[in-house]
């Protein structure tokens, strides 16, 4: 059985303040069944950025329809970027369970924010 890969192709992304940022993530397999979540930072304190199942993420949308059968693209778009959004973002695959079990993380994408051009 091929090992699941979580692919974040860009090591870094630079966005002007006020613009939207797209953070790309694909998985190499539909198996095992379970959600993808996005986090900022690593370790115990990491911040939840997007979770399809539940939560309040007014500035974050999925690029593809994550409910679509056979979807393997879990990229997100964050709107109206500010300097406070800078950081390293991780796309993380979980195995469905009670609770869900973390399986694999992408390598991370560092988001930097440029001053808005005048």
């Amino acid at each position: 059985e091929e090992e699941l890969q979580v692919i974040q192709p860009e090591k870094s992304v630079s966005v002007a303040a006020g613009d939207s940022a797209t953070l790309n993530c694909t998985v190499s397999s539909l198996i095992p069944v379970g959600p993808i979540q996005w986090f900022r930072g690593a370790g115990p304190g990491r911040e939840l950025i997007y979770n399809l199942k539940e939560g309040h993420f007014p500035r974050v949308t999925a690029v593809s329809d994550p409910t679509k059968r056979n979807n393997m693209d879990f990229s997100i778009r964050i709107s109206n970027i500010t300097p406070a959004d800078a950081g390293t973002y991780y796309c993380v695959k979980f195995r469905k369970g009670s609770p869900d079990v973390e399986l694999k993380s992408g390598a991370g994408t560092e988001l930097s924010v440029r001053a808005k051009p005048s």
Epitope: Q37, G43, P44, G45, E47, D100, E102
Partner: antibody, heavy 117, light 108 residues
């Protein structure tokens, strides 16, 4: 405005139990880790326990096996169940919001726990 | 576990003067060091993280420096509201999160 309000402290005897609560408001509670830090009278800060956004729990060695941290996201509330309390657990217990940098950016005012016979 | 040692334990400074105190880590923490201020009867307040980044709303008179195992917090011109206890905390290796023993800044 971010607010964290602890409650549940009080005077208990050694060996007894107590449950602390921390009501959070002003931020999306589900999106952040939260933690407990304590301060014995006249002493410095000691980290006690943390619960991540996914529910993973972490404890200081001094409380492992006696204290249990939990969260109720529907109530935006953090808890600390403290069993088999000892005199050395006497302290002000603070809850704090954890940033993605693993620092504590907002703190409650604390609740005093006194363990004495 | 990373042990943080702060010095001096107490610092006596006159208002308007510069105050500098240090935090030494038992092993390298890179730039992952934070500073907190605590006034009597109050909760701690985050001042600095990543060794030199001021937290939201913290005045420019507070500055942090250092990397590896040696760190410094400087208050360029002490105001009356700055007399307090200051704690360092490493945020690179967890658990446990560890704090230094504190430096008390008192009025000379």
């Amino acid at each position: 405005d971010v607010q964290l309000v602890e409650s549940g402290g009080g005077l208990v005897r050694p060996g007894e139990s107590l449950r602390l609560s921390c009501a959070a408001s002003g931020f999306t509670f589900t999106n952040y880790a939260v933690t407990w830090v304590r301060q014995a009278p006249g002493e410095g800060l000691e980290w006690v326990s943390l619960i991540s956004v996914t529910g993973t729990t972490y404890y200081a060695d001094s409380v492992k096996g006696r204290f249990t941290i939990s969260r109720d996201n529907s109530k935006s509330t953090l808890y600390l169940q403290m069993n088999s309390l000892r005199a050395e657990d006497t302290a002000v217990y603070y809850c704090a919001k954890v940033t993605w940098k693993n620092v504590f950016d907002y703190w409650g005012l604390g609740t005093l726990v006194t363990v004495s016979s | 576990e990373i042990v943080l040692t702060q010095s001096p334990g107490t610092l006596s400074v006159s208002p308007g003067e510069r105050a500098t105190f240090s935090c030494r880590a038992s092993q390298t923490v890179g730039s992952k060091l934070a500073w907190y201020q605590q006034k009597p009867g109050q909760a701690p307040r985050l001042l600095i993280y990543d060794a030199n980044t001021r937290a939201t709303g913290i005045p420019a008179r507070f500055s942090g420096s250092g990397s590896g195992t040696e760190f410094t917090l400087t208050i360029s011109s002490l105001q009356s509201e700055d007399f307090a206890v200051y704690y360092c905390q490493q945020h690179t290796d967890w658990p446990p999160y560890t704090f230094g023993g504190g430096t008390k800044v008192e009025i000379k």
